[in-house]
């Protein structure tokens, strides 16, 4: 819900970080929408899931995502780049056994079926924004965020702190 600092030199710290507990500190179902109130929806097509960003018709039910929050412990870092300590990480699962994954090679966001323990590609550092929106930074590729591109979710590189408030990487979570 709140202010973000800027893209820091997360690379080493994020790659070295470990999830401190196998259990999430909390998890709940929420619908995910963009800054411009478009809904994130999930559709099963040819035995795989597709992710869409679209305007829902009035009274159309929003898809829910299970968000699981984990505490990540970084190694101590005295370099002053703002990255050591405990961070809040999240996984997103729209349906049983499927999780959002960052495909860094293709710059895409995909749904993969997998078992626990989940791979690093399924974890995103949660950033709360001052506009009561959130953004999701790839654990495996610091400075890269889930964003909206051509009515799909994609991975978007954010290279300066000014760009952290760009609308295409901001998302809203709601109970309805």
């Amino acid at each position: 819900a709140f202010g973000i600092s800027g893209v820091q030199k997360y690379t080493r710290a994020l790659h070295d970080s470990s999830i401190t507990g196998i259990s999430p500190i909390t998890e709940y179902l929420a619908s995910l929408s963009t800054y411009n109130d478009q809904s994130i929806t999930f559709a099963l097509e040819d035995e795989s899931y597709e992710i869409y960003v679209e305007d829902l018709k009035k009274d159309e039910k929003k898809d829910k995502v299970l968000l699981s929050y984990y505490e990540s412990q970084h190694p101590s870092n005295e370099s002053g780049d703002g990255v050591d300590g405990k961070m809040l990480m999240v996984t997103l699962s729209p349906t049983k056994d499927f999780w959002l994954h960052a495909n860094n090679k293709e710059h895409s966001v995909e749904l993969h079926k997998c078992e626990k323990p989940l791979p690093d590609q399924a974890f995103f550092v949660l950033h709360n924004m001052h506009s009561n929106c959130v953004s999701f930074e790839c654990k495996t590729d610091p400075g890269v965020f889930i964003g909206v591109k051509d009515n799909h979710l994609a991975l978007i590189k954010v290279d300066s702190s000014e760009n952290l408030c760009t609308e295409n990487i901001l998302f809203k979570l709601s109970e309805t």
Epitope: G3, S5, L88, L126
Partner: antibody, heavy 122, light 107 residues
């Protein structure tokens, strides 16, 4: 261990300003944000705003916007809260509190300063 | 702003009693709720974060539950050092807001 040590009590006249300090130790100061919370005598807690120690990014509660300034000095690991145009309603204990998580503000605190009593009286 | 309503505002109890304090948010806050204990002249101390997570070093007689709008802090067996004022705080959206407090007094 993590410690937040605040400056001593202040007595101010209405219309004056006060600047409270919060010296951090036991962790990398630039990794975490600091919030300021106040408590009037016999009353509840009120969040005033937040500062990111790393780059000075601030977010103030609307009630204090234009009257409060939060700053940090990374060379001394100290956060400051200045409140201007004081009136008797500002008589309170002012606390600094550290974010539980680094990297971004999530509104969760783990460590608090001991508090600074600011009395506004003519 | 999200209003946080705590009840009761005060409770008289004896050592060994089970004490329950509730906190209601004016709108859903998922699990983003913390509980604090405050003694006179002291800073608040975190007991529970994210609705149900016990802060390190806090005795296991304290527990938290709830999500959405309704939350509970339970002290399973009140100890002499537990007589204090307890506050809830929502961390879901700005501005952060606190409940009005519940004073736990000796019967």
């Amino acid at each position: 261990q993590v410690q937040l040590v605040q400056s001593g009590a202040e007595v101010k006249k209405p219309g004056a300003s006060v600047k409270v300090s919060c010296k951090a130790s036991g962790y990398t100061f630039t990794s975490y944000g600091i919030s300021w919370v106040r408590q009037a005598p016999g009353q509840g807690l009120e969040w005033m705003g937040w500062i990111r120690a790393y780059n000075g990014y601030t977010n103030y509660a609307q009630k204090f916007q234009g009257r409060v300034t939060m700053t940090t000095d990374t060379s001394t690991n100290t956060a400051y809260m200045e409140l201007r145009t004081l009136n008797s309603d500002d008589t309170a204990v002012y606390y600094c509190a550290r974010d539980r998580y680094s990297g971004s503000f999530h509104g969760n605190f783990d460590y608090w300063g001991q508090g600074t009593l600011v009395t506004v009286s003519s | 702003d999200i209003q946080m309503t705590q009840s009761p505002s005060s409770v008289s109890a004896s050592v060994g009693d089970r004490v329950t304090i509730t906190c209601r948010a004016s709108q859903g806050i998922f699990s983003w709720l913390a509980w604090y204990q405050q003694k006179p002249g002291k800073a608040p101390k975190v007991l529970i974060y994210a609705a149900s997570n016990l802060e390190s070093g806090v005795p296991s007689r304290f527990s938290g539950s709830g999500s959405g709008t309704d939350f509970t802090l339970t002290i399973s067996s009140l100890q002499p050092e537990d007589f204090a004022t307890y506050y809830c705080q929502q961390a879901n959206s700005l501005p952060l807001t606190f409940g009005g407090g519940t004073k736990v007094e000796i019967k």
